[in-house]
Amino acid sequence: MALPTARPLLGSCGTPALGSLLFLLFSLGWVQPSRTLAGETGQEAAPLDGVLANPPNISSLSPRQLLGFPCAEVSGLSTERVRELAVALAQKNVKLSTEQLRCLAHRLSEPPEDLDALPLDLLLFLNPDAFSGPQACTRFFSRITKANVDLLPRGAPERQRLLPAALACWGVRGSLLSEADVRALGGLACDLPGRFVAESAEVLLPRLVSCPGPLDQDQQEAARAALQGGGPPYGPPSTWSVSTMDALRGLLPVLGQPIIRSIPQGIVAAWRQRSSRDPSWRQPERTILRPRFRREVEKTACPSGKKAREIDESLIFYKKWELEACVDAALLATQMDRVNAIPFTYEQLDVLKHKLDELYPQGYPESVIQHLGYLFLKMSPEDIRKWNVTSLETLKALLEVNKGHEMSPQVATLIDRFVKGRGQLDKDTLDTLTAFYPGYLCSLSPEELSSVPPSSIWAVRPQDLDTCDPRQLDVLYPKARLAFQNMNGSEYFVKIQSFLGGAPTEDLKALSQQNVSMDLATFMKLRTDAVLPLTVAEVQKLLGPHVEGLKAEERHRPVRDWILRQRQDDLDTLGLGLQGGIPNGYLVLDLSMQEALSGTPCLLGPGPVLTVLALLLASTLA
């Protein structure tokens, strides 16, 4: 009598008792060993002699033991063991070769849920098609941004498939990119074809400057045309200064003679002279440098009648050397609010910054910082680290300058200084930050989030949590629960809904008793381990009329995994045609008891299930 194959497999979860049970079933011929199980027990794959074959716990191996594993050894492991290995490699920060990464990715047969737990660079080798849908792809490509794309050569198939998928994920139509798009693409921005360079030069050229490899022909031609065109951000070559040349360093090889001829020759000479003096300028890996103030003219006395008595519109017409000679730094500092009301060229702003730097070498006072305006964009993170910003008004004023753009390193440093100065993320600060940067909260580590007082949670809007991962929601959910505890049922649910990705099973069960009618989008964000123990009746109550949406999501987690845990009879009561439940008459052994018995967490993930015919005894007797 042929019995269905046992599923899923034990992996590292087998206790001696369960192992004996399995052995008994195998010997009776009632459970066929599946391919992956055979691989683990050495029945089909080559014997595994290496360290990965049978350690009590992969996470107990040292980085040295993990470092040199060969692909052949990985191919003998189950998917769960491979995932466990990948997580251990990430935790121990083991640097892997391209071959090892490719091999690991190949063995992770289905898209991993816990992207944050995997080695960053491993994601480059996963197929982006496996992360379809706005949420999944956003999570995937947010992580890819931080990976080292240059592990893959430009022509590598894995790299070539990433860019189109990323563009689709971020909703880019045509060739026009925003600054946010370029930032979201990370290293993949270096692969954008020439048409993007042509249409989005203002935001893309500064990114291409720091691309490690040479640009391809198509990109070079587009960059050359854009630079020759003289549009933002660099302006016409005839107006370039030494600081422009500094900023353009990575693109200098693409310039071509027509552009070089139109740059003022004095500038080219000054730049060459400095480049030859300073060997660091010849290092190709140095990324884009902030334009620095350069004294390109001799210090000259201020012409008579030009000495600035106040900061007014007449300064618009001052040349750089005149600003340097005729504007007193103390006057500038006391009238910073006026500076903000007058348009200066970026070159003039360089001079003004230089004057303030000389006046305040230890860092600017807050009275000056609050009125920096566009001058803030000239500051480096190093400048900002010298500041002591305590007023929320100052913070707002500077965030306003950067409004509409992604968070720059300057803004990140400013926020960091401000929050550290306050000691915690209070409600007003959080309100302000999320108003300017809805994703701010999700850019914090779980450790940083732990300093958020529950009272601040009232300031959080659902969109502020869009990019949070499960680890962050695990920290935020208990705080939200505490913050909203005195609200009544329906109001409570409205507030807690966006935090539920961190909710445990018992809270979901409690919610199912309150007619909350959770929508599918929220349900899909719940923790898989929290959803699995829910009964069909509980899920039906939890979703209310939205339960019909389960059909459309039956192939996706957590719905897919939940279906596998339910009796088919129970699923049928929903009338949705959900398939994949446990057939009638099957016995379910929940091996998660292993954790309680051995004290070692089961590495397979939540509640592995082994299905065997309940008629076992009857058949034996027969």
């Epitope: 933002p232 519109e313 618009i316 017409f317 500076v339 903000n340 009301a341 007058i342 348009p343 200066f344 060229t345 970026y346 702003l349 305006g373 566009y374 001058l375 964009l377 300058v401």
Partner: nanobody, 117 residues
Framework: QVKLEESGGGSVQAGGSLRLSCTTS?????YKWMGWFRQAPGQEREG???????????YYSDSVKGRFTISRDNAKNMIYLDMTRLRPEDSAVYEC??????????WGQGTQVTVSS
């Protein structure tokens, strides 16, 4: 995307006149300042004339005061620079620009003006 395009440049005898035009397109209404700048070969770019769109108040560099006039036609999204009594030292590439409080943000490609004596 914001675009600025100058026209009207050319060669003229000293004492002559020219009218430069700048066509602006894209989302330019939010920019409070419009202006004309010039750059002669090997020289730094210098401001010539600017207009504050909040009250149409105009400002000029000392070297062109009384000879040049800046104006705008809001309906047509145009900025003009009327140049009279031109001198050889006015020869340069003239560019229009628009900006916020605090900084000039967008620049045109420039149009060449040559004044011969």
């Amino acid at each position: 995307q914001v675009k600025l395009e100058e026209s009207g440049g050319g060669s003229v005898q000293a004492g002559g006149s020219l009218r430069l035009s700048c066509t602006t397109s894209g989302y330019t209404n939010s920019y409070k300042w419009m202006g004309w700048f010039r750059q002669a070969p090997g020289q730094e770019r210098e401001g010539v004339a600017v207009i504050y769109t909040g009250n149409d108040r105009t400002y000029y560099s000392d070297s062109v005061k009384g000879r040049f006039t800046i104006s705008r036609d809001n309906a047509k999204n145009m900025i003009y620079l009327d140049m009279t009594r031109l001198r050889p030292e006015d020869s340069a590439v003239y560019e229009c620009a628009i900006g916020h409080d605090g900084a000039w943000r967008y620049w045109g490609q420039g149009t060449q003006v040559t004044v011969s004596s």
